[in-house]
């Protein structure tokens, strides 16, 4: 009975040629959308020249699928029983799951304004970003089209700096051709409990974007967990996206297409300030933006973006503390909209639906010698867009999951 | 290749003005912006003037400021420095530089103004 | 106005010397420090940007070091056509400015 059930998973589950497990590893048989809702500023003059709160309109879905790319450069080694891979980033636009096409423009901060006002501030090389500002009349707000946004667009300041810099801008970019890792996982042949936990990435156990436990590499990357999974674990993965290891708590018992699921979620302490879970004191990396140590539901992800402003948050700064949405109007942060979950099926570890969601602000800060930045009279950490990306089983999956899984344990 | 050559220097009396001159070939001046450093005999380096790129802001030394002017000629891709009002204490070997981020990684050869009666 | 403090104002050494020379800031400047060489009669050169950048074409016997206030410039191992006065320079904020100088002579 359930020894031999036991068996069939653990054999199942292991990360190689012929398993159930692998076949979804290598190249998922869920269709994944990223949706994204741009922050589409109303009041850019007011801001620029009288430093008030920041009008902003959500606008959106504008929806891609995603991650329909097989594994790459997909190796065993049979010596420490591990797989490495790379996972191949590409995006299609979906326009009838959209509300607008991908020529449709938003007005957003000047992601190359705010970012080398951030990276460069001495005093110096300012007058001299004023002059390149000023020269191609860039403002401290600009109108891009949601393409240019998202997968870049040349930006008319950074392409007057007289040496060898990268002058594409966009939030993702580069993306598509590009792939993310190179991932090493344990496939499971030894010790079925370590199954697609992540060994090293990029070939480090750690990031070195954090200090102490922070910058540890944990767990798996979120689409599988080792199987036979208790509701009173705490799920521990690595998301590049955020630069960070994170963690999932179980919250309720959910029924997937008929297959029973333990819903997990990313809770508000994960996000919290150190003053109300020490453990998160290494996510606080200066003391000025943070309130020494205070603010909370924001992260500093800039040693991870070359230095650019970059904070990551929950949309609509779901979670944050009140002085970072303070000088932002126009959100409404609600948990069922916009906190990320993850659908497990306990036996096999498998995640069978899944929903990420977060929001990407840049830091943009008062700055003496620029003229578009000169009248701020305090820092903002702007919004420019959230996304969720979804992922579920499909039907034909979700019986065949039925009845050669849960079915036969049930 | 990268070149900048001052002309312009001489003697002059107290008082009396002069205007340097810095042709610039191997780069576009106006992506740059040129700096004036001077260095009086047996002196070290002083900072004097500044035209940052495209045509921006000009900024000068307390010493000189008042007194001198820096401009520049896109379309003769050279710089310029006014002087006037000129005193003892301006002699020296007046040097334009190249720079872009604050460090001067091309220099002219120097051209000497001596102020004396 | 950042003051730029430069130690020694001169120094005599060997061929094959190592050779250290100083620069203090009057106030944090970061890694905006440049170090250059100038010879009698000529026009200074770039050696090292941003405190520790090598400046191309310079021999890798010369590097830079220190971050803030505190400033390095070391020659490993000193040629004859080393001897010559060396500048440090703050590209931080305007005014720049420049040490004194050291003038590195034959011993």
């Known amino acids: 009975g359930d020894l031999l059930i036991q068996k069939t998973i653990k054999k199942q589950v292991v990360l190689e040629e012929g398993t159930i497990a692998f076949k979804n590893w290598v190249k998922t048989g869920t269709e994944v959308y990223r949706q994204f809702w741009i922050f589409d500023v109303q009041n850019p003059q007011e801001v620029m020249m009288n430093s008030s709160n920041i009008q902003v309109k959500q606008r959106g879905p504008y929806t891609y699928r995603v991650r329909f790319l097989a594994k790459e450069n997909v190796t065993q080694d049979a010596e420490d029983n591990t797989v490495s891979f790379l996972q191949p980033n590409g995006a299609i636009f979906e326009p009838s799951l959209s509300v607008g096409t991908e020529a449709d423009n938003f007005t957003v901060l000047n992601l190359a304004v705010a970012a080398a006002s951030h990276i460069y501030q001495n005093q110096f090389v300012q007058m001299i970003l004023n002059s390149l500002i000023n020269k191609s009349k860039s403002s401290m707000f600009q109108v891009r089209t949601l393409r240019e946004l998202l997968w870049g667009y040349r930006d008319p300041f950074l392409s007057l700096v007289p040496y060898p810099v990268t002058t594409t801008v966009g939030l993702f970019y580069p993306y598509n051709n590009t792939a993310d890792g190179v991932y090493k996982v344990f496939n499971g042949k030894d010790n079925i409990s370590k199954v697609a936990i992540i060994d090293t990435y990029k070939g480090k156990r750690n990031l070195s974007y954090w200090e102490s436990h922070c910058d540890m590499i944990n767990g798996t990357d979120a689409a599988s967990f080792p199987p036979f999974v208790e509701k009173s674990q705490v799920l521990q993965f690595f998301s590049s996206d955020i630069c960070r290891s994170i963690y999932a708590v179980f919250e309720s018992d959910v029924n997937l297409k008929g297959i029973p699921v333990y819903r997990f979620v990313l809770p508000s302490k994960a996000f919290a300030s150190p003053v109300e879970n020490p453990d998160n004191y290494c996510f606080c990396t200066e003391k000025i933006i943070s309130k020494n140590c205070t603010s909370y539901g924001v992260l500093d992800i800039s040693k991870c973006k070359e230095g650019r402003p970059v904070y990551i948050s929950l949309p609509h700064f779901l979670y944050a503390s009140p002085d970072v949405s303070e000088p932002i109007d126009g959100l409404n942060p609600n948990e069922e909209e916009h906190r990320t979950y993850l659908d497990i099926e306990p036996i096999t570890g498998f995640t069978l639906q899944f929903a990420k969601r977060l929001q990407v602000n840049l830091l943009v800060k008062p700055s003496e010698k620029i003229q578009v930045l000169k009248n701020l009279k305090r820092n903002y950490i702007v919004p420019i867009l959230w996304l969720n990306e979804t992922g579920t089983i499909g039907d034909e999956k979700a019986n065949m999951f039925r009845s050669q899984v849960t079915g036969k344990i049930n | 290749e990268v070149q900048l050559v001052e002309s312009g220097g001489g003697l002059v009396q107290p008082g009396g003005s002069l205007r340097l001159s810095c042709a610039a070939s191997?780069?576009?001046?106006?992506?740059?912006?040129i700096h004036w450093v001077r260095q009086a005999p047996g002196k070290g380096l002083e900072w004097v003037a500044w035209i940052a790129p495209y045509g921006g802001e000009t900024y000068y030394a307390d010493s000189v400021k008042g007194r001198f002017t820096i401009s520049a000629d896109t379309s003769k891709n050279t710089a310029y420095l006014q002087m006037n009002s000129l005193r003892a204490e301006d002699t020296a070997v007046y040097y334009c530089?190249?720079?872009?981020?604050?460090?001067?990684?091309?220099w002219g050869q120097g051209t000497l103004v001596t102020v004396s009666s | 106005d950042i003051q730029m403090t430069q130690s020694p104002s001169s120094l005599s050494a060997s061929v094959g010397d190592r050779v250290t020379i100083t620069c203090r800031a009057s106030q944090d400047v970061s890694n905006w420090v440049a170090w250059y060489q100038q010879k009698p009669g000529k026009a200074p050169k770039l050696l090292i940007s941003?405190?520790?950048s090598l400046y191309s074409g310079v021999p890798s016997r010369f590097s830079g070091s220190g971050s803030g206030t505190d400033f390095t410039l070391t020659i490993s191992s000193l040629q004859p056509e080393d001897f010559a006065t060396y500048y440090c320079q703050q590209h931080s904020n305007a005014p720049l400015t420049f040490g004194q100088g050291t003038k590195v002579e034959i011993k």
């Open positions: 191997g780069f576009t001046i106006a992506a740059f912006g």
């Open positions: 941003y405190a520790t």
């Open positions: 530089a190249r720079s872009f981020f604050g460090y001067f990684d091309y």
